[in-house]
Amino acid sequence: KTLVLGKEGESAELPCESSQKKITVFTWKFSDQRKILGQHGKGVLIRGGSPSQFDRFDSKKGAWEKGSFPLIINKLKMEDSQTYICELENRKEEVELWVFKVTFSPGTSLLQGQSLTLTLDSNSKVSNPLTECKHKKGKVVSGSKVLSMSNLRVQDSDFWNCTVTLDQKKNWFGMTLSVLGFQKASSIVYKKEGEQVEFSFPLAFTVEKLTGSGELWWQAERASSSKSWITFDLKNKEVSVKRVTQDPKLQMGKKLPLHLTLPQALPQYAGSGNLTLALEAKTGKLHQEVNLVVMKVAQLNNTLTCEVMGPTSPKMRLTLKQENQEARVSEEQKVVQVVAPETGLWQCLLSEGDKVKMDSRIQVLSRGVNQT
């Protein structure tokens, strides 16, 4: 018995070959002997049953001369899964058609971090097929009648080529995934005290009409609880602020990409935030983490202090030195001090390995004079 695979809604070609490689009489039947179509010697395709009953069934007249009499079934339905009989040259060929349906749950447009389940359904009792989907960038996911893709990333978007294999017979189908998310899962901004701060949240997808709502929650390092800094709506890509905290006085752009500015980087704002975006007609939310590290350099009485506030890594080093001189203090901690600093230009650097994350300069006028 020959096996043919077909996807619901598409077409399948069931083979039937003559040994003499020339035109001959043939008949395609269902397993209950009802005639589907055939050729009875005049080179004319004769259909069985009523026209509407068999309008999905056809053959390739152009192939008859070569001794090939395939049965073409268009717009495949699940109930087409059965055995078909081709009668020719006093013999019967049995062809089994397995029609499968592919369902994507919850769909092919998902949010970053969500999972996709691809299910093959069929009303024929076939043994487990092998299903394999390959992304154009090389990622491969495989399963049987159920294939799962978890924790989807923006880079999983685009076309996937999927193959269903059963008894060495293959059928392929494509799926286009759209994974909506931010370009970066997390970002960190380093600023000197008093500088303006920019937070940008570019989306990694473009849609014609983007509608939803969002909020930025902020957990300051020095605060015991988080605070909602801003809430906003998004309609057809236009941002409108609903509510904004009075401290800090944030400004938000009305065009995408989502963009926020803080008038000043102050120690009390150092910390981390979480921007959430809920999109219309989508369950779940998009998230982007943003971190603010603030550097403060000050001279008070007889001591020069450099301090960083906010989420720094333990590998980061804070260095305080006179410009063009060797480091005076360099430690893997968040505060460094020099007592009785010499007059001149001092520099504080926050670095990780050989990479300087930020630096701040201060002019020390004379010992014991306040200067910030």
Partner: antibody, heavy 119, light 107 residues
Amino acid sequence: EVQLLESGGGLVQPGGSLRLSCAASGFTFSTNAMSWVRQAPGKGLEWVSGISGSNGNTYYADSVKGRFIISRDISKNTLYLEMNSLRAEDTAVYYCAKERDNWNGFDYWGQGTLVTVSS
Amino acid sequence: AIQMTQSPSSLSASVGDRVTITCRASHVIRNDLGWYQQKPGKAPKLLIYAASSLQSGVPSRFSGSGSGTDFTLTISSLQPEDFATYYCLQDYNYPYTFGQGTKLEIK
């Protein structure tokens, strides 16, 4: 061809009211953001009020908030500015302006209508 | 509201001169800034949008640059018809705000 035609200006006493209209044609009025901009005699330009094309949200300069109301009638392709509790400092030429499709500036302006607030 | 500081407030120049007008925003506004030209008794005219894009029909001697907080309008070679008042406008968010204007006069 895009056209914006303001009307409704005139002389009004302090504390009085006036409604300006801006008849628009030549573009999809319902989806375009629109604004009112004014210019006091011999002074610079001041943005007064705006209405979003996508969601109909309304926005105002602090100087007119609570006194002016911007609105639109999509069936008539007309933008309005309802001005109440008028003050002498509201005396200006009022322009209606159309924003570019992607909110990048005002690409078309009306000819302006003069509002004079005086007793 | 975001403040826009434009300078100079007035400027005298001759035909053929290269002229630069600057605008500074009190907040970072990306490139959400436009430049307008206004002649006496006339409505303003958009010259530059999105900080550096030339509006259709505007001569190429006009150019804009900058992003964040500092912006510049440059007229590479002044023509007699360029003597007018120029304004910058931030359209980063509402309420929109104009600069105070720069009056460009013939020297």
